[in-house]
């Protein structure tokens, strides 16, 4: 599914980093880990030191400030989670610094963060019906729902 073209005129301005060094566990209690330089995957870990630690940066939309829009960065790196298309793995994109302003095609760096109880969902701003998801024997990807797992638990203060 192509990104919604009407999003291109919405500007997202960086506010600040709101979370540092947290781990994402899916509903099967699998942690997100690095698969390789480009991709992420999920695995059941005995030692959470092997899990990817993320930072979360908050953005404000020029269109509506009531929604929580975030960027996900691997802690202590310049690698950012980037959406592709449905059922495609999310990519790790290297950037010299966190973008101060995001608009147009760059919205594949942004996610709507929704919490409900202990569940956390990350919907792609570029693909509003797709979530960051884990899938058995596959990389972390964008998916619309089952059989992929779209809800995550945030484990904080793991550093």
């Amino acid at each position: 599914s192509a990104p919604f073209s009407f999003l291109s005129n919405v500007k997202y301005n960086f506010m600040r980093i709101i979370k540092y060094e947290f781990i994402l566990n899916d509903a099967l209690n699998q942690s997100i880990i690095r698969a390789n330089d480009q991709y992420l995957t999920a695995a059941a870990l005995h030692n959470l030191d092997e899990a990817v630690k993320f930072d979360m940066g908050a953005y404000k939309s020029s269109k509506d400030d009531a929604k929580i829009t975030v960027i996900l960065r691997i802690s202590k790196t310049q690698l950012y989670v980037t959406a592709q298309d449905e059922d495609q793995p999310v990519l790790l994109k290297e950037m010299p610094e966190i973008p101060k302003t995001i608009t147009g095609s760059e919205t594949n760096l942004l996610f709507f963060w929704e919490t409900h109880g202990t569940k956390n969902y990350f919907t792609s701003v570029a693909h509003p019906n797709l979530f960051i998801a884990t899938k058995q024997d596959y990389w972390v990807c964008l998916a619309g729902g089952p059989p992929s797992i779209t809800d995550f638990q945030i484990l904080e203060n793991q550093a």
Epitope: L7, I18, K63, A66, I68, T115, H116, G117
Partner: antibody, heavy 118, light 113 residues
């Protein structure tokens, strides 16, 4: 699962202030919005305001802008709602709620009855 | 502020029959960027705090019986109880959380006929 426990009933004089606390057990407010809602006797629900601690952002209904203060302690386990310049029509049950980073309530406190009477 | 208007104010339905409550917002609560309707439904029984039934207009909260369903988009929403049970007697409220201040409907009282 987060449980919200509110402070006890209060009887206040007109013109005074009341501060109601809302303690989260089994979790913290870190990832959540906190909303405060009141219900006058026999009436419906009225949204007073809320806070998203992670953003340090507070929102108020216009009617309460000047006399409502919403805060959260540093441990992110207790929220407070202070209403000043109380009037008899502020007599109501005051509820805190949380559980999402949007302003809807998944978990609710038991309510705190505030009576304003001379 | 967005005004939420519920209809009817009260409703008497026979046990096992369908109950339908409508909620209309004075402006759209659909956020086009993520295709979500920022609307919730609550049930409140006397002496108790409200209980969340539905959020995002149609997502049923865990543990809520499947006879409760939410539908609608934009400005017009419906809460349906497909087969009314005695324990469903309560006041039901819709709430928009699209923009602040968040606002509630005035409530609909559901009784047994």
């Amino acid at each position: 699962q987060v449980q919200l426990v509110q402070s006890g009933a209060e009887v206040k004089k007109p013109g005074s202030s009341v501060k109601v606390s809302c303690k989260a057990s089994g979790g913290r407010f870190t990832n959540y919005a906190i909303l405060w809602v009141r219900q006058a006797p026999g009436q419906g629900l009225q949204w007073l305001g809320g806070i998203i601690p992670i953003f340090d952002e507070t929102d108020h209904a216009q009617d309460f802008q000047d006399r409502l203060t919403i805060t959260v302690d540093e441990s992110m386990t207790t929220a407070y709602m202070e209403l000043s310049s109380l009037r008899p029509e502020d007599t109501a049950i005051y509820y805190c709620a949380t559980g999402s980073n949007s302003y809807y309530g998944l978990y609710w406190g038991q309510g705190t009855l505030v009576t304003v009477s001379s | 502020d967005i005004v939420m208007t519920q209809s009817p104010d009260s409703l008497a339905v026979s046990l096992g029959e369908r109950a339908t409550i409508n909620c209309k917002s004075s402006q759209s609560v659909l956020y086009s960027s993520n295709n979500k309707n920022y609307l919730a439904w609550y049930q409140q029984k006397p002496g108790q705090p409200p209980k969340l039934l539905i959020y995002w207009a149609s997502t049923r909260e865990s543990g809520v019986p499947d006879r409760f369903s939410g539908s609608g988009s934009g400005t017009d929403f419906t809460l349906t109880i497909s087969s009314l049970q005695a324990e469903d007697v309560a006041v039901y409220y819709c709430q928009q959380y699209y923009s602040t201040p968040s606002t509630f409907g005035q409530g609909t009282k559901v009784e047994i006929k």
